[in-house]
């Protein structure tokens, strides 16, 4: 039986050209957790491997930096970047569990961060 | 098995710059964080930042910034930081350790710092 | 930035005590991680996310929290976990480590 559950940033804005830390926690639940993924729509970002560390997909790979822990950073924010992003746990003996994030990039200085987690 | 190698330690001058290593082996050095970690007797340990060697992405406590730069050389898995315009505030012993999504795993043995006046 | 206070700062236990130390976040916080460290070396991965044991350290230590408060349990105490333990955070930029509880065996 699945128990846990994942905390998001949940919807966030930021404005265009700056960065934003998107993060996912998963909580409740002593699966251990192998792999996350990190998802745009159904384009693949980067994975975090509990074994191999990180993988960051080569079209992403200017842009899209690590951390901090499980979190990812986008970097160079242009307005095509707002969407869904998703945080795919995969764990055992769970299975998998996502989260989901929903950036909006503005054109302007009123950006405001999700509350959740703290964004610098 | 990885492992990191830090340079030994420093006795530098005030005012001057110091730049010290640590060198990674046992793991594929663009896959994970290397973060930098300051200990000192009265302020224990403090975050000063850490770069993705992957892409060369830095992120650093807004304390250290301008007084800490982070580079790494991925052809010889090294990770350096440079630290400026020394005072004795900045004696102390500094730590890289990776990180890999789950906290920092593995240490080096630390690089002692001594300002000298 | 989020203040990591734990307490004890010093604490002695004796062997086969039960041991627990605190690290309060001034901030809510989704996870806590802890570090070992002994006198002369490096700090040392103990717990992460809040309750996983990292490799080769003993069942006897366990972990747990939420929000703001967190905790590291040593059901008996043993001769060899004498050492300081820090807690460290990254819910927000900048990550921060708590000052220490010093567990010396008594």
């Known amino acids: 039986m699945m128990t846990g559950t994942i905390e998001t940033t949940g919807n966030i804005s930021a404005e265009k050209g700056g960065s934003i830390i998107l993060q996912c926690h998963l909580s409740s639940t002593t699966a251990q957790v192998t792999q996350v993924n990190w998802e745009q729509q159904d384009q693949l970002l980067a994975i975090c491997n509990a074994d191999l560390g990180w993988h960051i997909s080569p079209s992403f790979k200017d842009r899209v930096a690590p951390g901090p822990g499980l979190g990812l950073t986008l970097q160079s924010l242009t307005v095509n970047d707002t969407g869904e992003y998703f945080c795919i746990y995969h764990t055992y003996p769970d299975g998998t569990y996502t989260g989901r994030i929903f950036l909006e990039v503005l054109e302007s200085s009123v950006a405001e961060h999700g509350a959740r987690f703290q964004i610098p | 098995q990885a492992y990191l190698q830090q340079s030994g330690a420093e006795l530098v001058r005030s005012g001057a710059s110091v730049k010290m290593s640590c060198k990674a082996s046992g793991y594929t050095f663009t896959s994970y964080n290397m973060h930098w970690v300051k200990q000192t007797p009265g302020q224990g340990l403090e975050w000063i930042g850490y770069i993705y060697p992957g892409n060369g992405f830095t992120n650093y406590n807004q304390k250290f910034k301008g007084k800490a730069t982070l580079t790494a050389d991925t052809s010889s898995s090294t990770a350096y930081m440079q630290i400026s315009s020394l005072t004795s505030e900045d004696s102390a012993v500094y730590f890289c350790?990776?990180?890999?999504?789950?906290?920092?795993?593995?240490w080096g043995q630390g690089t002692s710092v001594t300002v000298s006046s | 930035q989020i203040v990591l206070t734990q307490s004890p700062a010093i604490m002695s236990a004796s062997p086969g005590e039960k041991v627990t130390m605190t690290c309060s976040a001034s901030s809510s916080v989704s996870h806590m991680h802890w570090y070992q460290q002994k006198s002369g070396t490096s700090p040392k991965r103990w717990i992460y996310d809040t309750s996983k044991l990292a490799s080769g350290v003993p069942v006897r230590f366990s972990g747990s929290g939420s929000g703001t408060s967190y905790s590291l349990t040593i059901s008996s105490m043993e001769a060899e976990d004498a050492a300081t333990y820090y807690c460290?955070?990254?819910?927000?930029?900048?990550?921060?480590f708590g000052a220490g509880t010093k567990l010396e065996l008594k």
């Open positions: 350790a990776r990180e890999g999504g789950w906290a920092m795993d593995y």
């Open positions: 460290q955070q990254w819910n927000s930029n900048p990550s921060t």
